[in-house]
């Protein structure tokens, strides 16, 4: 009887051991499959994120292109209209000019003396920039770069005058501290007679022959 029971117990142990072993194998296989599924999901997630990002960037690019296209179209139609007009006033800003509050602005990249810059603007049916407000000052500062830049303000004929006749005394001013000093020590038969934006945007008077950048301004027809 005893030996029979012992035999059955041994058989049960073996069966259980086999069951445990096979279960362990199955659990391991399932776990491995689960890991693979997790990895696949992660890979799919990152692929999806990348595609979403790419789409978003493409969308942004497309929007920019559309905006630029609309702007170019407007500019082109405006210039065609201008060609039919008598050209006395600008109905739109020329190519490479920037529009701000009804005026067109052109920012030079090279350097010229104040008289040369003044002549250049006149040949473009414009004048050296006249700053009428803090807002216009900010706009110019934003676009001019960290370089001395001529404006349409001079005292070569005596008092400080804006080239377009805007009243200097009552108008906007943004001089650096202790400027203008109209320094006479340079021996040029006059003081520092021309005003420029310094690299921080504030104004300084300097020798008019210095090779600085410049900004041209032209009025745009307010009716359009």
């Amino acid at each position: 009887q005893n030996s029979k029971l012992r035999g059955e117990l041994q058989a049960l142990r073996e069966t259980f051991s086999n069951f445990t072993a096979s279960t362990e194998v199955e659990v391991k296989a399932l776990s491995s499959q689960g890991g693979n599924v997790g990895r696949k999901m992660k890979s799919l997630e990152s692929q999806l994120e990348k595609q979403q990002k790419d789409l978003s960037e493409d969308h942004s690019d497309l929007l920019l292109h559309v905006k630029q296209f609309v702007s170019d179209l407007r500019s082109l139609s405006c210039q065609i209209a201008a060609l039919h007009g008598n050209g006395s006033t600008l109905t739109c800003c020329p190519v490479n000019w920037l529009e701000y509050e009804g005026s067109c602005y052109w920012f030079s990249r090279s350097g010229k003396s104040w008289p040369e810059a003044d002549k250049y603007c006149q040949l473009e049916s414009a004048h050296l920039v006249v700053v009428n407000s803090r807002e216009e000052q900010k706009f110019i500062q934003h676009h001019m770069g960290p370089v001395n830049t001529w404006m349409g303000l001079t005292d070569q004929s005596g008092p400080w005058k804006w080239v377009d006749g805007t009243d200097y005394e009552t108008g906007f001013k943004n001089w650096r501290p202790e400027q203008p000093d109209d320094w006479y020590g340079h021996g040029l038969g006059g003081g520092e007679d021309c005003a420029h934006f310094t690299d921080d945007g504030r104004w300084n008077d300097d020798v008019c022959q210095r090779p600085y950048r410049w900004v041209c301004e032209a009025a745009r027809d307010p009716a359009t």
Epitope: R109, S110, G111, S113, G145, P146, V147, N148, W183, G185, H186, G187, L188, G189, E192, D206, V207, Q209, R210, P211, Y212, R213
Partner: antibody, heavy 120, light 107 residues
Framework: QVQLVESGGGVVQPGRSLRLSCAAS????????MHWVRQAPGKGLEWVAV????????NYADSVKGRFTISRDNSKNTLYLQMNSLRAEDTAVYYC?????????????WGQGTTVTVSS | DIQMTQSPSSLSASVGDRVTITCRTS??????LAWFQQKPGKAPKSLLY???SLQSGVPSKFSGSGSGTDFTLTISSLQPEDFATYYC?????????FGGGTKVEIK
């Protein structure tokens, strides 16, 4: 420390071309104007060309206008001088020099120079 | 172009002497003038800018003055290392132009 090192000099026949380089280190190259100045044997200094900090403005001495081209690569901190149609009178030591500002403020740092000899 | 005239073209001096070099321009240049020192076989070294401002690291025995068309470089007490050629240069406008140089020799 601030350093400018010229290279590319040598002996060249009249009418031929040469390209000088100037490697800059020790300062933020892209914020300074750069110049080339030359000195013929036994003579004084002669300014050759300037390029502004961003490459937007270039000016040349009348003696080299139309033959020499100044350029820069701010990503490589390098200044160049392309010299075409070389003449005997272009024989000199060529120095690159840093402008004190963007390109109109005078020279402060100089390289050691590279010699260009134009001879047949 | 702005012409630069330096004088004298050469001078002999002794250690300890006070030396003055002058530079005259063909038109007014404000104070946009620099002075350089060059020793044989070496690159020029910047001494002064804006006519009277000393470059960093340059000893105070060097001083500059003038504006307009007339400028001077002064070495208050000449030392052996100061024997060299000195150049003035205008940078008011392009083309930048140099003076012909002044050679300072030992007496």
């Amino acid at each position: 420390q601030v350093q400018l090192v010229e290279s590319g000099g040598g002996v060249v026949q009249p009418g031929r071309s040469l390209r000088l380089s100037c490697a800059a280190s020790g300062f933020t190259f892209s914020t300074y104007g750069m110049h080339w100045v030359r000195q013929a044997p036994g003579k004084g200094l002669e300014w050759v060309a300037v390029i502004w900090y961003d490459g937007s403005n270039k000016n040349y001495a009348d003696s080299v206008k139309g033959r020499f081209t100044i350029s820069r690569d701010n990503s490589k901190n390098t200044l160049y001088l392309q010299m075409n149609s070389l003449r005997a009178e272009d024989t000199a030591v060529y120095y690159c020099a840093r402008d004190q500002g963007v390109g109109y403020d005078g020279l402060d740092v100089w390289g050691q120079g590279t010699t260009v000899t134009v001879s047949s | 172009d702005i012409q630069m005239t330096q004088s004298p073209s050469s001078l002999s001096a002794s250690v300890g002497d006070r030396v003055t070099i002058t530079c005259r321009t063909s038109q007014g240049i404000g104070n946009y003038l620099a002075w350089f020192q060059q020793k044989p076989g070496k690159a020029p070294k910047s001494l002064l800018y804006k006519a009277s401002s000393l470059q960093s690291g340059v000893p105070s025995k060097f001083s500059g003055s003038g504006s307009g068309t007339d400028f001077t470089l002064t070495i208050s007490s000449l030392q052996p290392e100061d024997f060299a050629t000195y150049y003035c240069q205008q940078y008011m406008t392009y083309p930048l132009t140099f003076g012909g140089g002044t050679k300072v020799e030992i007496k």
